[in-house]
């Protein structure tokens, strides 16, 4: 099966969710672990991240499909401070599979308003920070 | 544990520079933006500035901008804040602070260091 | 620059009494985090995001609030919450400021 990993973003008021989806098949989740990285290009590990999830394998789910896992990191208000590039990475213990996904950044601009960068292109987002609202 | 600790406070002359440290342990600090925080004597608290967890991007607050400089070293675990120009009202107990990541507050701050300026 | 204005700027009460901080701010501001000091030692967040408690914090208190008005409660005031407590937001591009502080004593 194939294993990977997508980055997206979304906006609720002056929330910013940064979301790493991790796609996997039921009997692999175990042992994997699902990590958000900051201006971090060679060393993205569980150590360095801002924040990881380790995955457990889910007996109330039937059958052998394709599942996901997603790890959430929520920025209140973003400020100057957040401004970088991140990267949503996993790893396996058990198989030794490491996946890494794309770039993406965020830009926090002189207006006061943030721009979200490098996810697909639907996921180009632009927020006004004072009204909270995607532009 | 979080630990912050201060240090190179102490008697400085108006005009005259200083430069504190604080030693940060208990945390990947590479990850996290710093600040600087002061408290006047029996006052209250004062943002002073602020800096990304990268080191590029620093942020002062108008009354000590061209005058004190934030920085860090992220292989030491350390930030520092160069103090040049001071004046009396910058007598204060300068506090290192961590910023949350995920929020606007700042959650470790230092035992703090004093610092006066007087003739 | 935003400012914060809190009230009253000292106040004392008694065990077990109902206490209301209020910080009010300037011009609108998304959230209001709140600070506890007690003389000799370092701020300890309280109160971040409104209304989340600070780990270790007592259940006795409380935040609320939205735009300008934000307040900081505990509900049966003890002893140890005797304090100096301020509250703080961020904004741009004036970034971080707090409120004067309210030194609350005990009776």
């Known amino acids: 099966g194939c294993i990977n990993i997508t980055s997206s973003a979304s906006q609720e008021g002056t929330r910013l969710n940064l979301i790493c989806t991790v796609w996997h098949k039921k009997e692999e989740a175990e042992g994997f672990v699902v990590f958000l990285c900051k201006d971090r290009s060679g060393d993205c590990s569980p150590e360095t991240s801002l924040k990881q999830l380790r995955l457990k394998r889910d007996p109330g789910i039937d059958g052998v499909g394709e599942i996901s896992s997603q790890l959430m990191f929520t920025i209140s208000q973003v400020t100057p401070l957040h401004s970088g590039t991140y990267q949503c990475c996993a790893r396996s213990q058990k198989s030794g599979i490491r996946l890494q996904g794309h770039f993406f950044s965020i830009l926090f601009t002189e207006t006061g308003n943030y721009t979200v960068t490098g996810l697909k292109q639907r996921q180009h987002l632009e927020f006004s920070h004072n009204e909270g609202t995607l532009s | 544990e979080v630990k912050l600790v201060e240090s190179g406070g102490g008697l400085v002359q108006p005009g005259r520079s200083l430069k504190l440290s604080c030693a940060a342990s208990?945390?990947?600090?590479?990850?996290?933006?710093m600040a600087w925080v002061r408290q006047a004597p029996t006052k209250g608290l004062e943002w002073v500035a602020s800096?990304?967890?990268?080191?590029?991007?620093?942020y002062y607050r108008d009354s000590v901008k061209g005058r004190f400089t934030i920085s860090r070293d992220n292989a030491k675990n350390t930030q520092y804040l160069q103090m040049d120009s001071l004046r009396s009202e910058d007598t204060a107990t300068y506090y290192c602070?961590?910023?949350?990541?995920?929020?606007?507050?700042?959650?470790?701050w230092g035992q703090g260091a004093m610092v006066t300026v007087s003739s | 620059e935003i400012v914060l204005t809190q009230s009253p700027t000292t106040m004392t009460a008694s065990p077990g009494e109902k206490v209301t901080i209020t910080c009010r701010a300037s011009?609108?501001?998304?959230?209001m985090h709140w600070y506890q000091q007690k003389p000799g030692a370092s701020p300890k967040p309280w109160i971040y995001?409104?209304?989340k408690l600070a780990s270790g914090v007592p259940d006795r208190f409380s935040g609320s609030g939205s735009g300008t008005s934000y307040s900081l409660t505990i509900n049966n005031m003890e002893a140890e919450d005797a304090a100096t407590y301020y509250c703080?937001?961020?904004?741009?591009?004036?970034?971080?400021?707090f409120g004067a502080g309210t030194k609350l004593e005990i009776k």
């Open positions: 800096i990304h967890s990268g080191g590029g991007n620093t």
């Open positions: 995001e409104t209304s």
């Open positions: 703080q937001q961020w904004n741009y591009p004036s970034m971080y400021t």
């Open positions: 011009s609108s501001v998304s959230y």
């Open positions: 602070v961590t910023h949350n990541y995920e929020s606007t507050v700042f959650d470790y």
């Open positions: 208990g945390f990947t600090f590479s990850n996290y933006a």
